[in-house]
Structures are given as structure tokens and as C-alpha cells.
């Protein structure tokens, strides 16, 4: 799998985009995972509806959500309030029991917002029970990892 | 119709290859997953794997994986089964299946081949 | 990999009986990915039930599944001549999709 990355700025949304072939995967739930280290293990953040007819709909977990469209073929997942912290390497999956697909891999770059001059102290946090229903997206960036990059720094 | 149609029965000695088919037709072949499936003389049915001839994606059964070779050639709506070394004991009915989409994400095989008997002995 | 257990090996009931037969899994498995096969002598298995209790096409209404989790049941509400055979279930959560041993339902 090549891996595709996303850049957001600082503080707004951004919007990842997991395209897949929907007959072979129907059926199927999703979800959106955290790889741990080059070679550890993906944890998962957030997935998708347990009944697969309702896939359409928004889940959340924190400032992430999920949702899929299961005839168009194309996961979707949210991550609001962008935060340093949340660059990295994520993976879109298509599950199978205890088994997973990778459907895309993801390589999350979180720039500064060059408006922004407050202190990391003054960021805001969502709070449990905030709504993001309605959260503006920003237009997200992405490319594909030329061959040879690789998303993790080197290990000394 | 929709229907799966299976190549003819074979009989063959330890240690030759083979390879059975399995075309499918009245579906769009390339989306939809194709099983194998043994079943050996007063048994009862064992899954050996799957292809979707979409992008030829293979799973196999542990029991199977080494021992058989699934693949599919989609410009002629054709799935294979095949062995590089038989042994008696591959002796058996093989079906192919067609993993069916449901209304609700729901699937199950619901289109089988009438079934290719393979039998090995010296 | 799930095994699927099938219960009883052998079941002898007289036509115009309910039959009963049960299907366990090694562990969980989404009702939506648990199917029920008839098979008859020297024929292809056909499909029965997918999603645990939905009828597939062409299926009389006499059978019906039901079940979730690691427990599922297909039942023959009254035994029709045609329904004396072979029945297997089958999970297609997660590979391998592995079937049960099978039930045969004969006559009494």
C-alpha cells in the first residue's frame, strides 16, 4: 500500500478520504486506526456503526469521527480541532471478525496555522458534550508518498 | 440466469498437477467473491478459500494454504483451483460458490457449481 | 479460526414433525454473516437462511432461523418429504469461513 498524506492546519478540521471497491467489501465494517512505530500494531480510534446499514452514520470518538458511504464506496473520517499531536500514521481498515483490511494508509501532517499567535496554553479543547454535526471542514491536502519517503523519521 | 458451471471430473495420478475451473456467468463476475469448497466422499463440506476476481484478493483456509492455488482470470469470467502435486488423499467433490450481497450487508453462498470430481489413485 | 459446531449429529423425525437443529460457534459472530446450507444426495449444497434469519430466494416459509452471538437455530416448522438431507451452517465473519459438521435430518 502506497501511503497518501493529509495536511491540516492547526486548530481546524480536517477531513481523510478512504476510497474502496464496494461490492468487494460489502458487508463490511470500517474503521480508522493509529499505527504505533513503524512496525507496531494499528490501535483503533474509531469504527463504524455495528449495524452496517447504518454506516452512514457519524460516529465519534473525541475530536474523531467516522462515517461511510457503503454503496459509493468511500470512508470518511473527520478529525476536529487538529492538534500537533494527532500527525502520524493512520490506516483506514475493512474488518473482517478479528481480521482487517487496510484499505488506505494515511500519513496525518498537522501545519501551524499562520494566524494563530496564542499561546499552545490558550488552545481550545472540545468539550464531551460539544455537538460537531455542523463543524465547517477545511479542504484538506493530500498527496501520495513518493517512493523512498518514509513516514517515520529513522530510529537512532 | 445467473449460474456457476464446473469443469468436468478428472482422475489422476500422485503426483501430477491439476487444475479445475469454474465459470461463472449471467453476473458481473469481477464483484463478487468465489469460493471453494471440498467435500470428501461421505463428508461434509469444508471451506478452502475465496478469490474476488475484482483485483484477484485470496484468502485461504490454513488447512489449505500451500496445497492449492486459487486464482481467476476475470477477461473470461473464469475462477481456477489448482494442485502442482496430487495426493490420494485430494480425492473429493470440489464445489465453486458465489458470495452473494444482501440487502443489510448480509452474505452467503448462493450461487454453487454442480461440482468437480477429482480422483487420485495410482 | 471459529469452529462451528453442529448439534444433533443425526436427527430421525417422521414427516409433519418440527425439527430442531443447532448451530454453536467457537466464539462471537455477527448474526449478519451466519448462514444455513441444505444439501441432498449427489446434488450441490443450496443456499437456506443468510443473516442468521432472512429466507433466501425460492425458500419455503416452513424454514426459519434464528439465534445471535455464538448460538443459532434453524427450524423446520413441519417436515415435507423433500426435506429429509443434509444441513450445514457456515460463518462468513471471519476468515477461514468455516461450516459446522452438519445435521442429517432422515427419516424415522
Known amino acids: 500500500h502506497n501511503t497518501t498524506v493529509f495536511q491540516g492546519v492547526a486548530g481546524q478540521s480536517l477531513q481523510v478520504s478512504c476510497p474502496y471497491d464496494s461490492m468487494k467489501h460489502w458487508g463490511r465494517r470500517k474503521a480508522w486506526c493509529r499505527q504505533l512505530g513503524e512496525k507496531g500494531p494499528c490501535q483503533r480510534v474509531v469504527s463504524t456503526h455495528n449495524l452496517w446499514l447504518l454506516s452512514f452514520l457519524r460516529r465519534w470518538n473525541g475530536s474523531t469521527a467516522i462515517t461511510d458511504d457503503t454503496l459509493g464506496g468511500t470512508l470518511t473520517i473527520t478529525l476536529r480541532n487538529l492538534q500537533p499531536h494527532d500527525a502520524g500514521l493512520y490506516q483506514c481498515q475493512s474488518l473482517h471478525g478479528s481480521e482487517a483490511d487496510t484499505l488506505r494508509k494515511v500519513l496525518v501532517e498537522v501545519l501551524a496555522d499562520p494566524l494563530d499567535h496564542r499561546d499552545a496554553g490558550d488552545l481550545w479543547f472540545p468539550g464531551e458534550s460539544e455537538s460537531f454535526e455542523d463543524a465547517h471542514v477545511e479542504h484538506s491536502i493530500s498527496r501520495s508518498l513518493l517512493e523512498g519517503e518514509i513516514p517515520f523519521p529513522p530510529t537512532s | 440466469e445467473v449460474q456457476l458451471v464446473q469443469s468436468g471430473a478428472e482422475v489422476k495420478k500422485p503426483g501430477e498437477s491439476l487444475k479445475i475451473s469454474c465459470k461463472g456467468s449471467?453476473?458481473?463476475?469481477?464483484?463478487?467473491?468465489i469460493g471453494w469448497v471440498r467435500q470428501m466422499p461421505g463428508k461434509g463440506l469444508e471451506w478452502m478459500g475465496i478469490?474476488?476476481?475484482?483485483?484477484?484478493?485470496?484468502r485461504y483456509s490454513p488447512s489449505f494454504q500451500g496445497q492449492v492455488t486459487i486464482s481467476a482470470d476475470k477477461s473470461i469470467s473464469t475462477a481456477y483451483l489448482q494442485w502442482s502435486s496430487l495426493k490420494a488423499s485430494d480425492t473429493a467433490m470440489y464445489y465453486c460458490?458465489?458470495?452473494?450481497?444482501?440487502?443489510?450487508?448480509?452474505?452467503?453462498?448462493?450461487?454453487w457449481g454442480q461440482g468437480t470430481t477429482v480422483t487420485v489413485s495410482s | 479460526e471459529i469452529v462451528m459446531t453442529q448439534s444433533p449429529g443425526t436427527l430421525s423425525l417422521s414427516p409433519g414433525e418440527r425439527a430442531t437443529l443447532s448451530c454453536r460457534a467457537s466464539?462471537?459472530?455477527?448474526?449478519?454473516?451466519l448462514a444455513w446450507y441444505q444439501q441432498k444426495p449427489g446434488q450441490a449444497p443450496r443456499l437456506l437462511i443468510y443473516?442468521?434469519?432472512n429466507r433466501a430466494t425460492g425458500i419455503p416459509d416452513r424454514f426459519s432461523g434464528s439465534g445471535s452471538g455464538t448460538d443459532f437455530t434453524l427450524t423446520i416448522s413441519r417436515l415435507e418429504p423433500e426435506d429429509f438431507a443434509v444441513y450445514y451452517c457456515?460463518?462468513?465473519?471471519?476468515?477461514?469461513?468455516?461450516f459446522g459438521g452438519g445435521t442429517k435430518v432422515e427419516i424415522k
Open positions: 457456515q460463518q462468513d465473519d471471519s476468515a477461514p469461513y468455516t
Open positions: 443473516g442468521a434469519s
Open positions: 466464539q462471537s459472530v455477527s448474526s449478519s454473516y
Open positions: 460458490a458465489r458470495a452473494g450481497h444482501y440487502d443489510g450487508g448480509h452474505l452467503g453462498m448462493d450461487v
Open positions: 478469490i474476488y476476481p475484482g483485483d484477484s484478493d485470496t
Open positions: 449471467g453476473y458481473s463476475f469481477t464483484t463478487y467473491w
